[in-house]
């Protein structure tokens, strides 16, 4: 006869491990007992369980409540046992010793591998600002057994670096994603992907990038110079910019206070029916927590009675 077992049994933390040991005997052979022991190198054998043809299952005190026989029907030549709720400390070498009649004793070893799936965590780096050099966008850490694989999935251009820390029964892997921040990255997803044999599918953690920036400011509304004449209604100037975080707008007049009747509505400056009093230099001030920008325009309200055309100068300053 001969023993049938597995070289390696792999189980995920918390699952039940079936330790197989089947005696394929000749006709008339009987199994008297199957003794299971843990036999890690450098340590003495630690008895696990005894399956006896007459006495039944004995579980050693160290494994009380954790070792069972597989559910019926059972073959009397099957010495397999179930190790309930596998923990990392169960990982190691096991031996089944089968005493048969009349063939004598047989033994076989297997290795129990307990996979510890990782619980990854993603930590964003410092605030990203346009104009910075190579900056840490995020780091992703996952610890498991065996060591997990940590990669990144993103459309954003960047560089990665990984490091690994080995513990007694596991390994922690940390991967960092570095980039040169630009406004085009704002709102883009950066996804940490963790792969591990104990996971049915990759674990993914997504971080949305936030890059602080402030675009140059410009003023719209003076494109058609002929519209800026005395008596015109609905004239307005609009300040154009964009930023992260969204900027706030402030209007001032460089050569004096804003004329009465001029309404400030965020990025828009609304005028009452135009008079020559509305001529002047207007400044749009755009700011957010990252930066500030200015854009100024000169408004020259045209008197239709005069022959001279309206002159408009646009000046932008930062």
């Amino acid at each position: 006869g001969e023993l049938e077992t597995s070289d390696v049994v792999t189980v995920v933390l918390g699952q039940d491990a079936k330790l197989p040991c089947f005696y394929r005997g000749d006709s008339g052979e009987q199994v008297g007992q199957v003794a299971w022991a843990r036999v890690d190198a450098g340590e003495g054998a630690q008895e696990l369980a005894l399956l006896h043809s007459k006495y039944g299952l004995h579980v050693s005190p160290a494994y009380e409540g954790r070792v069972e026989q597989p559910p019926p029907p059972r073959n009397p030549l099957d010495g397999s046992v179930l190790l309930r709720n596998a923990v990392q400390a169960d990982e190691g070498e096991y031996e089944c010793r089968v005493s048969t009649f009349p063939a004598g004793s047989f033994q076989a070893r297997l290795r129990l591998r307990v996979l510890v799936p990782p619980l990854p965590s993603l930590n964003p780096g410092p605030a990203l600002e346009e104009g910075q050099g190579l900056t840490l966008a995020a780091s992703c850490t996952a610890e498991g057994s065996p060591a997990p694989s940590v990669t990144w999935d993103t459309e954003v251009k960047g560089t990665t670096s990984s490091r690994s820390f080995k513990h007694s029964r596991s390994a922690a892997v940390t991967s960092e994603f570095h980039l040169v921040p630009s406004r085009s990255m704002n709102g883009q997803p950066l996804t940490c992907v963790v792969s591990h044999p104990g996971l049915l599918q990759d674990q993914r953690i997504t971080h949305i990038l936030h890059v602080s920036f402030l675009a140059e400011a410009s003023v719209r509304g003076l494109e058609d110079q002929n519209l800026w004449h005395i008596g015109r209604e609905g004239a307005m100037l609009k300040c154009l910019s964009e930023g992260q975080p969204p900027p706030s707008y402030n209007w001032t007049r460089l050569d004096g206070p804003l004329p009465s009747g001029v309404r400030v509505d965020g990025d828009t400056l609304g005028f009452p029916p135009l008079t020559t009093e509305h001529s002047g230099i207007y400044v749009c001030h755009v700011s957010n927590e990252f930066s500030s920008r200015d854009s100024q325009v000169t408004v020259d309200v045209l008197d239709p009675q005069e022959d001279s055309g309206k002159q408009v100068d646009l000046v932008s300053a930062s």
């Epitope: 008297g32 007992q33 003794a35 008895e47 005894l50 006896h52 007459k54 006495y55 039944g56 299952l57 004995h58 050693s60 005190p61 010793r97 005493s99 004793s105």
Partner: antibody
């Protein structure tokens, strides 16, 4: 025919010592675990100690641990129980017994006692 | 330690009677249970091992049953030589422990 014969019992004062012997014959002594079991007068049976075939594994009842020592000499087919620091509550008939050999090389369980000696009386009294 | 509780502690019966003695373990012991017979002034004698296996040379009127925690010794037809004290013993763990005994007396 399997035979187990105990000797060495007697009267001893509290704190004293005795060495019991058990001579085995009629079987291959070195193939079996052996045990000592005692029975106080008018009381039930109490397991005392067991020893593996080679003498490499020994088990003791908590009540005698540190005071009694089990040993064997396979060349003489003899089992021993060295009893020190004897107390009045150790007074009993001491039996040596052979363990049934149907569990192979597994120390966590004991097996039934299929052959017993006639017993030797140990009396601890001042 | 595993406690073994026998009942009854004593019983009176007549020759030919069917006698049943029970033994309960404080925790599961599979079939790691033996029954012994002891007559006054004599050493115990193994009757049943593995809860239900008859030891060689023991009359077939003796039988055992049970597994786990509850066990029974039955004498199908009591004979004069059966009047004695009976002990159960678990050998699932060290220390092996005995029941307190059941004395079978003549009615």
């Amino acid at each position: 025919e399997v035979q187990l014969v105990e000797s060495g019992g007697g009267l001893v004062q509290p704190g004293g010592s005795l060495r019991l012997s058990c001579a085995a014959s009629g079987y291959s002594f070195s193939d079996y675990w052996m045990s000592w079991v005692r029975q106080a007068p008018g009381k039930g049976l109490e397991w005392v100690s067991s020893i593996k075939q080679t003498g490499g594994v020994k088990h003791y009842a908590d009540s005698v641990k540190g005071r009694f020592t089990i040993s064997r000499d396979n060349s003489k087919n003899t089992l021993y129980l060295q009893m020190n620091s004897l107390r009045a509550e150790d007074t009993a008939v001491y039996y040596c017994a052979r363990e049934y050999s149907d569990v192979v090389d597994y120390v966590s369980v004991r097996t039934p006692l299929d052959y017993w000696g006639q017993g030797t009386l140990v009396t601890v009294s001042s | 330690d595993i406690q073994m509780t026998q009942s009854p502690s004593s019983l009176s019966a007549s020759v030919g009677d069917r006698v049943t003695i029970t033994c309960r373990a404080s925790q599961g012991i599979s079939s790691y249970l033996a029954w012994y017979q002891q007559k006054p002034g004599k050493a115990p004698k193994l009757l049943i091992y593995a809860a239900s296996s008859l030891q060689s040379g023991v009359p077939s009127r003796f039988s055992g049953s049970g597994s786990g925690t509850d066990f029974t010794l039955t004498i199908s037809s009591l004979q004069p030589e059966d009047f004695a004290t009976y002990y159960c013993q678990q050998h699932y763990t060290t220390p092996p422990t005995f029941g307190q005994g059941t004395k079978v007396e003549i009615k």
